[in-house]
Interface confidence: medium
């Protein structure tokens, strides 16, 4: 396989990182908020 | 719970290899980018290398290339540290990491290189 | 390679005080995105390190709001409102602007 540039620029595979980590976490929180009210209405 | 777990460190003479092993759980391995970084007794972060959600594109610093070879294997979720041709210069804790922007590390496995 | 560089390289501090930590670089992180590509990590003893701000600016999940980053270019800063004790450690900034990624040499924060 051949050899990659010497220094390379992976800031746009580390924009999309950010993104989809950004997405997750905010799933995450609204998956939280759901229990949490589901919670409140089970009481 | 995102959790990394790094082995295989230990001690080796100078010339010879060790293979270093990640195991992630706790996310999508094959969805995230995966990076080795390193730090010799008492010093500062090394970033060593890193690798690509399908293994095709992977990048290291100056001081490892020809020697060192990270891989991974999706199925296994797991990462990997070929060392070879290993040098005095080498010894530090290994750690492995989440991502680019290394969003989680492992405890580290510490390499020894000595005679 | 991009060179980073830390000052001060040790910062003794008083639990409750503001404190800053200065990172530089041998070039612009600014990308033509409008993001610096600069990360900050904190090592505490005996323990590996953590991501606390990405691109330049982004606390981290579950990293205190009283962590804040900035600066644009080649300069960047690390701001702590107030200092508290489990803040102890080492902190390294890291340009991620091209491959190789590399480090700062660390600045060391202390409780005085």
């Known amino acids: 396989s051949e050899e990659p540039p010497i220094s390379l620029d992976l800031t746009f595979h580390l924009l999309r990182e950010v993104l989809e980590m950004a997405r997750a976490e905010q799933l995450a929180q609204q998956a939280h908020s759901n229990r949490k009210l589901m919670e409140i209405i089970g009481k | 719970e995102v959790q990394l777990v790094e082995s295989g460190g230990g001690l080796v003479q100078p010339g010879g290899s060790l293979r270093l092993s990640c195991a992630a759980s706790?996310?999508?391995?094959?969805?995230?980018?995966m990076s080795w970084v390193r730090q010799a007794p008492g010093k500062g972060l090394e970033w060593v290398a890193n690798?690509?959600?399908?293994?095709?594109?992977?990048y290291y610093v100056d001081s490892v290339k020809g020697r060192f070879t990270i891989s991974r294997d999706n199925a296994k979720n797991s990462l990997y540290l070929q060392m070879n041709s290993l040098r005095a210069e080498d010894t530090a804790v290994y750690y492995c990491?989440?991502?680019?922007?290394?969003w989680g590390w492992g405890q580290g496995t510490l390499v020894t290189v000595s005679s | 390679d991009i060179v980073m560089t830390h000052s001060p390289l040790s910062l003794p501090v008083t639990p409750g005080d503001p404190a800053s930590i200065s990172c530089r670089s041998s070039?612009?992180?600014?990308?033509?995105?409008?993001?610096?590509?600069l990360d900050w990590y904190l090592q505490k003893p005996g323990q590996s390190p953590q991501l606390l701000i990405y691109l330049g600016s982004n606390r981290a999940s579950g990293v205190p709001d009283r962590f804040s980053g900035s600066g644009s270019g080649t300069d960047f800063t690390l701001k702590f409102i107030r200092v508290e004790a489990e803040d102890v450690g080492v902190y390294y900034c890291?340009?991620?602007?091209?491959?190789?990624?590399?480090f700062g040499q660390g600045t060391k924060l202390e409780i005085k």
């Open positions: 990491s989440r991502g680019l922007a290394l």
């Open positions: 690798i690509k959600q399908d293994g095709s594109e992977n």
């Open positions: 890291m340009q991620a602007l091209q491959t190789p990624y590399t």
């Open positions: 070039q612009s992180l600014l990308h033509s995105t409008g993001y610096n590509y």
């Open positions: 706790g996310f999508t391995f094959s969805d995230n980018w």
